[in-house]
């Protein structure tokens, strides 16, 4: 006995009232011609003619998935019984945005869950949300094709002064977080060492408070705070920063011993370990990866290794004793 054995019993599908033998007879030599697959789909078991009662399976091209019942059945009248089936995109296409906007990362297709960031030239901000996530086959929030860049009020206010300052006669004074920051400015993720907490803050407010000597505020990254590697690294770099000998202002941020301020983006970018200069008395004794041996590294090397998300355990500050 075999469960796969065919004793010629006609099948009844859940949604069928009749057995196939009860359907009107057509000449025995007839069948069904190849059906037309949905857009972006194809027939898996492709051939010229199909027997009555035979099923064909609809498959979708890479980047698409079937929605609906994916089998067509050949009927005795030579037609196909087919439910609603379509091939829906499982990836998002790179959005079409105005030329002034830069998309990062720049790819042709994005997988579900991947995000993009829209940025503007220096002195301008995105007039709307700057971060979008691929969900299903569309972007969330939806990307308006009229989205553009607008003059950054921060830049207008500051004149020849530094970020967080404004021109007052011939001198520069700190902006007031309450009075000068009522306009829209992009969101930043910020860490407060006093409360040991991170939160989303408008750039204007953050810079104004930092100018007013609020040293406990640390920039983590552009955009609202979202759990993930960027936030994790932002918090870790804040902890490491207290021992950094270099503190170089760079856009919203401050660059430390293991970083370089990118002139084109005004962002701190981690160096790679071989770019670290040997100098500096900020040393750490560490264990790398699954190694049992101890190693003495300088703060630059420690910062670059942690930034690259390589496994490293800091055993203690200072040289290894052995």
């Amino acid at each position: 006995f075999s469960i796969m054995e065919n004793n010629g019993q006609p099948c009844i599908n859940d949604d069928e009232e009749m057995k196939e033998v009860d359907l009107p007879e057509i000449e025995a030599d007839s069948g069904c011609p190849q059906p037309v697959p949905p857009e972006n789909g194809f027939i898996r078991n492709e051939k010229q003619l199909y027997l009555v009662g035979e099923d064909v399976e609809i498959s979708c091209l890479t980047g698409f998935e079937t929605v609906g019942y994916q089998y067509f059945r050949c009927l005795p009248d030579g037609t196909w019984r087919q439910g609603d089936v379509e091939c829906q995109r499982t990836e998002c296409i790179k959005p079409v945005v105005q030329e002034v906007l830069t998309i990062t990362p720049f790819q042709r297709l994005y997988r579900i869950g991947e995000s993009i960031e829209l940025t503007c030239p220096k002195g301008f901000v995105v007039a709307g949300p700057s971060r979008y996530t691929c969900q299903g086959n569309s972007w969330t929030p939806p990307i308006s094709n009229s989205l553009t860049c607008e003059k950054d009020t921060l830049t207008k206010l500051k004149g020849h002064c530094q970020l967080g300052q404004k021109q007052s006669g011939s001198e520069c004074i700190c902006m007031s977080p309450e009075e000068d920051c009522s306009h829209h400015s992009e969101d930043l993720c910020v860490f407060d060492t006093d409360s040991n907490d991170y939160f989303t803050s408008p750039a204007c407010k953050f810079l104004a408070e930092k100018c007013l000597n609020n040293q406990q505020l640390h920039f983590l990254h552009i955009g609202s705070c979202q759990d993930g590697r960027q936030l994790e690294w932002g918090l870790e770099r804040t902890r490491l920063s207290s021992n950094s000998t270099k503190k170089e202002s760079c856009g919203y941020d401050t660059c430390y011993d293991w970083e370089k301020c990118s002139a084109s983006t005004s962002k701190c970018v981690c160096l790679l370990p071989p770019q670290c200069f040997k100098g500096g008395n900020q040393l750490y004794c560490v264990k790398m990866g699954s190694s049992t041996s101890e190693k003495t590294l300088n703060i630059c090397e420690v910062g670059t290794i942690r930034c690259a998300n390589r496994k490293m355990e800091i055993l203690h500050p200072g040289k290894c004793l052995a």
Epitope: P105, G228, Q230, K260, P274, Q275, G279, K295
Partner: antibody, heavy 118, light 112 residues
Framework: EVQLVESGGGLVQPGGSLKLSCAAS????????MAWVRQGPGKGLEWVAT????????YYRESVKGRFTISRDNAKNSLYLQMNSLRSEDTAVYYC???????????WGHGTLVTVSS | DVVMTQTPSTLSATPGQSASISCRSS???????????LYWYLQKPGQSPQLLIY???DLGSGVPNRFSGSGSGTDFTLKISRVEAEDVGIYYC?????????FGAGTRLELK
């Protein structure tokens, strides 16, 4: 001015050995990681190996692991590449390179030619 | 290993005109903290390579500002706004976002 001068290249038979040297000047040699990069005839560039300040950490591309050894002598301001079990595909101009905060390979020597042939 | 594909392999440019070279990586060079380690080098005839652009778009020390870099993710471009005779040579892109570091096969720039 940073100067890197390679030497030690030449013709060697497959399976043979060769030791390349790089003499560094114009900077404090012991303060920098150093690297070797090669360029096969009519081919692109290929990173070979990197060494840290004191030689306690070394890194190699997969195809040369176990055959090549990068080392340094900080007292002599010199970088070395000991190449054993040489193969024809190791034929290339070998460059000595130093990083900066801008790039991993910011300064390059003029190169020394290694030809592996029978 | 990450494969870096450069196009075109040869580029004929008219002095004073602009020229662009494309570099595409087999996987994204943007790491999980938002950094992209993409560099451009020029190797002039009979010389060793020299750094032009680092971190996608920053100009190397002493490099004329007619050179500029752009791009993100997997697609990058080097642009020369006004080609000069001294720009002749082979241009290489290089990535250091993933080990091992890898270079493109090069684009030869020649003058028309």
């Amino acid at each position: 001015e940073v100067q890197l001068v390679e030497s030690g290249g030449g013709l060697v038979q497959p399976g043979g050995s060769l030791k390349l040297s790089c003499a560094a000047s114009g900077f404090t040699f012991s303060d920098y990681y150093m690297a070797w990069v090669r360029q096969g005839p009519g081919k692109g560039l290929e990173w070979v190996a990197t060494i840290n300040y004191d030689g306690s950490s070394t890194y190699y591309r997969e195809s040369v692991k176990g055959r090549f050894t990068i080392s340094r002598d900080n007292a002599k301001n010199s970088l070395y590449l000991q190449m054993n079990s040489l193969r024809s595909e190791d034929t290339a101009v070998y460059y000595c390179a130093r990083p900066s905060t801008e790039a991993l390979f910011a300064y390059w020597g003029h190169g020394t030619l290694v030809t592996v042939s029978s | 290993d990450v494969v870096m594909t450069q196009t075109p392999s040869t580029l004929s440019a008219t002095p004073g005109q602009s020229a662009s070279i494309s570099c595409r990586s087999s996987q994204s060079l943007l790491n999980d903290v938002g950094n992209t380690y993409l560099y451009w080098y020029l190797q002039k005839p009979g010389q060793s390579p020299q750094l032009l652009i680092y971190l996608v778009s920053d100009l190397g020390s002493g490099v004329p500002n007619r050179f500029s870099g752009s791009g993100s993710g997997t697609d990058f471009t080097l642009k020369i706004s006004r080609v000069e005779a001294e720009d002749v040579g082979i241009y290489y892109c290089m990535q250091a976002s993933h080990a091992p570091y890898t270079f493109g096969a090069g684009t030869r720039l020649e003058l028309k």
